[in-house]
Interface confidence: medium
């Protein structure tokens, strides 16, 4: 597929290594890191980062590089959502956002990428080897899921690629044949990171782009996948999933979950804060699926304890077209 205005195709926004190395030395490692993150799973990228300011706080960022309408994004940890993972957040382009502890803030960055900040303290806080998975669904094309984790020894402020995936489901060229160049690049990147780790630690600066602000267009990944594909995913064992999360909330959720097609998502464990966060209009070319949305301006009913609505001061979100992913 091609876009009318091409943007860097495999480039997640906001380099996580910035501040840790000089700007010039950053470029190659970041490119390599990006390649490592996306190798074999070109439809979805996942970036997991430990925040330098709060060492037990994580930022998970995911993007969809396919062409098509995004119906729903599900972020889980401990593995894929349907395979032992626990839902952290569900982002619906029209009906808003729901999140569960320890998720602190889930938001759309562009029309095809999201970010999730996890609370660092408490029994349910993540640890370094936790696997985080993002699943993007598109109706009626398919769905994609990709996972990533932060290596236990990672320096704060550094982002890490997902570990190589034992389970990959996608119709994507090059899944099996990652070239030697890429492999070398990934090894070289690890070497750079290790070398950097043994240097005296420089003072880490916050990255230039505020996590609250939509990313600049130049960093937005090129969107294209309206086709509904299953997102490929990687699975990593983790011992950090909180046992309390499943029982923290009563089962059942707002009634809009019931109206979603069965392919859209697994019903989350229970109600939590709901933020109706519009997708930035300037994000990317991946259209948001019309199909799973409520009428413009429709708000989900207040159906459960602890469910709060955040009216969107910018008015009803624009609804866009669907094509499916599983």
């Amino acid at each position: 597929m091609r876009t009318e205005a091409q943007v860097p195709a495999l480039q997640p926004p906001e380099p996580g290594l910035e501040g840790a190395m000089g700007h010039r030395t950053l470029v190659l490692p970041w490119v390599l890191l990006t390649l490592c993150v996306t190798a074999g799973t070109p439809e979805v990228w996942v970036q997991v980062r430990m925040e330098a300011t709060e060492l037990s706080s994580f930022t998970i960022r995911c993007g969809f590089l396919g062409s098509g309408s995004i119906s729903l994004v599900t972020v889980s940890w401990g593995g894929p959502n349907g395979a032992g993972g626990t839902t952290l957040a569900v982002l619906h382009p029209e009906r808003g956002i729901r999140q569960w502890a320890p998720a602190r803030q889930a938001r759309w960055e562009t029309q095809s990428s999201i970010s999730l900040i996890l609370e660092g303290s408490g029994a349910s806080s993540p640890c370094a080897n936790t696997t985080f998975c993002c699943k993007f669904a598109s109706f009626p094309e398919g769905s994609w899921e990709a996972c990533g984790s932060l290596p236990p020894s990672s320096d704060p402020g550094l982002s890490a690629p997902p570990t190589p995936a034992p389970i990959l489901r996608a119709d994507l060229a090059g899944i099996l044949g990652v070239s030697g160049v890429l492999l070398f690049g990934c090894v070289y990147l690890l070497h750079l990171l290790r070398r950097h780790k043994h240097r005296p630690a420089p003072r880490l600066q916050p990255s230039r782009t505020s996590p609250q602000a939509p990313r600049a267009r130049a960093w937005a990944p090129s969107q294209a996948s309206q086709a509904a594909l299953h997102v490929p995913y990687a699975t990593i064992n983790t011992s950090c999933r909180p046992a309390t999360l499943d029982t923290a909330h009563p089962h059942g959720g707002p009634s809009w979950w019931a109206s979603l097609p069965t392919h859209a998502a697994h019903r989350p464990q229970g109600p939590a804060a709901w933020a109706s966060t519009p997708i930035p209009a300037r994000g990317s070319f991946v259209s948001v699926e019309n199909g799973l949305y409520a009428q413009a301006g429709e708000r989900p009913p207040h159906t459960g304890p602890g469910l709060t609505l955040f009216p969107d001061p910018r008015g009803p979100r624009a609804m866009e077209g669907p094509l499916g992913v599983r």
Partner: antibody
Framework: DVQLQESGPGLVKPSQSLSLTCSVT?????????WNWIRQFPGNNLEWMGY???????NYNPSLRNRISITRDTSKNQFFLKLNSVTTEDTATYYC????????WGQGTTLTVSS | QLILTQSSSASFSLGASAKLTCTLS???????IEWYQQQPLKAPKYVME???????RTGDGIPDRFSGSSSGADRYLSISNIQPEDEAIYIC?????????FGGGTKVTVL
Amino acid sequence: DVQLQESGPGLVKPSQSLSLTCSVTGYSITSNYYWNWIRQFPGNNLEWMGYISSDGTNNYNPSLRNRISITRDTSKNQFFLKLNSVTTEDTATYYCARGLRYGPWGQGTTLTVSS
Amino acid sequence: QLILTQSSSASFSLGASAKLTCTLSSQHSTYTIEWYQQQPLKAPKYVMEVKNDGSHRTGDGIPDRFSGSSSGADRYLSISNIQPEDEAIYICGVGDINNYIFGGGTKVTVL
């Protein structure tokens, strides 16, 4: 190269059930995608009928939900459309497709409902 | 109810520019739509998606002569320097909740 080929009886009597098969080559239907059925009426109007996903779950057009069933045989890499209680208004060319946008679509099979 | 409206036919001279319209029902005017091309005796083929803001994305193998735009509830498919092989039925489609709706199609004739 992924290819889809529809096959069916060509003629069905009213009130009977129609059964169509989509044979997929070059790609496993359990790997990914939604596997759709779409039909095109004689006036060229298209109607999306439903799909079976790669994990076997279904989604159907609400207007057909009470008489449609889409199933699959993973060992043969085929998926099937069954439409019950057909009438002459079900006369159409039936397409199977992997997704809609990415495709490919099959070439279609014409089905006539007539007594 | 989500409805897509298209004119039934249009004729264009060889080499001219063509602009086809697909109109969404007013309450769905922000939806993204898809365009499909169906050449005689062939299955429909995905051409592009057109968003509310007019941005568009074309499918594989679609010539650069094809582009999309938008105005209000109208979504456009433009073909510059129209060629004989562009003679086809052009159908718009849109997804809504758990359904997918097609327009009636515009039959394009190249004179």
